[in-house]
């Protein structure tokens, strides 16, 4: 819509709306994956740099997160992942480059990689939500 502000210009109130939409999607995806893949450990080789360090309060680093969700999409619940990608796209700064992420070829490592992404993303959303709720922006 022509009314809509460019996505990188959304105010904290709208960012908060998007985070509120993302939280149950992320939580549900993580819980379902944990039930389906019991006994898979978290990988210590994957670090999702999900927060920007250049803004106060921290901003969700959508451009860094999106490639991971695009990468795990074929291997997870596509419907939920698509909804997450749609929300993350709204938070993305225009013209920010996206790096390409490759998923580990080994099945067990791949499962561990996916679990780690989902866990770190959920924690990240919690962190951003808390910062948006803690007084003046």
């Amino acid at each position: 819509s022509s009314h809509m502000a460019p996505t990188h210009q959304l105010p904290p109130s709208d960012v908060r709306k998007i985070i509120l939409e993302l939280q149950p999607l992320s939580r549900g995806l993580l819980e379902d994956y944990q039930k389906k893949e019991t006994g898979v450990p978290e990988s210590n080789r994957t670090l999702l740099l999900c927060l920007t360090s250049d803004s106060q309060p921290p901003r969700l680093n959508s451009s860094a997160i999106l490639p991971y969700f695009r990468a795990i999409r074929p291997l997870s619940d596509k419907n939920i992942i698509d909804k997450i990608i749609e929300q993350l796209d709204k938070l993305k700064f225009q013209h920010e480059p996206e790096t390409e992420i490759s998923v580990p070829a080994d099945t067990f490592e791949c499962k561990s990689f996916i679990l780690t992404i989902l866990q770190q993303f959920s924690a990240c959303l919690e962190s951003v939500f808390k910062s948006l709720n803690s007084g003046p922006q």
Epitope: H3, P12, K17
Partner: antibody, heavy 118, light 111 residues
Amino acid sequence: EVQLVESGPSLVKPGGSLRLTCSVTGDSITSGYWKWIRKFPGNKLEYMGYISYSGITDYNPSLKSRITISRDTSKNQYYLQLNSVTTEDTATYYCARYANYGYAMDYWGQGTSVTVSS
Amino acid sequence: DIVMTQSPASLSVSLGQRATISCRASESVDTYGRSFMHWYQQKPGQSPKLLIYRASNLESGIPARFGGSGSGTDFTLTIDPVQADDVATYYCYQSYEDPWTFGGGTKLEIK
């Protein structure tokens, strides 16, 4: 043309619950954000909260313990419930649409006047 | 919460003259050069009507007599020239931060 129409009781007893309906035509409540706002006697306005296209709700912290916003997508209606009302909740209650991020509430209902009195 | 202070509370203007309404936020409502401040008009017994969004953008169907300006914390709604149909109460509100907050309103009358 988008239209929002508020309905509900005009008189509520102190300590009781207030339940209002917003009936939406011309747009689906499964897109955008659907808000409740109230205007007190003397014209002071208060933002109450919303229900989103996906059913997520968010409330003004000043009302959080008493407010519930819900919806029925089959009727294209959303609802406001306010519990433990006092005379301070006497106001005109409006529903409004917030369709796009970074925009503004573009359509409002006409409002429904609610008096809390015994 | 961001406090919105609107002035004057009432305004009496002659037909054809300019009406100016101010709104001040207790903190900036800007992000990346955009101001999340909006103005609407309410006539007795009618739905509130959006006039200006994001400080200076005229809503579709609103006459060009209405204009908005300002950034940061200080904003102005201008009606020039005022017509008889403009008798109403005008409100500002911010959608920058939750909870959204409103100005106290300005009642415009014709002299």
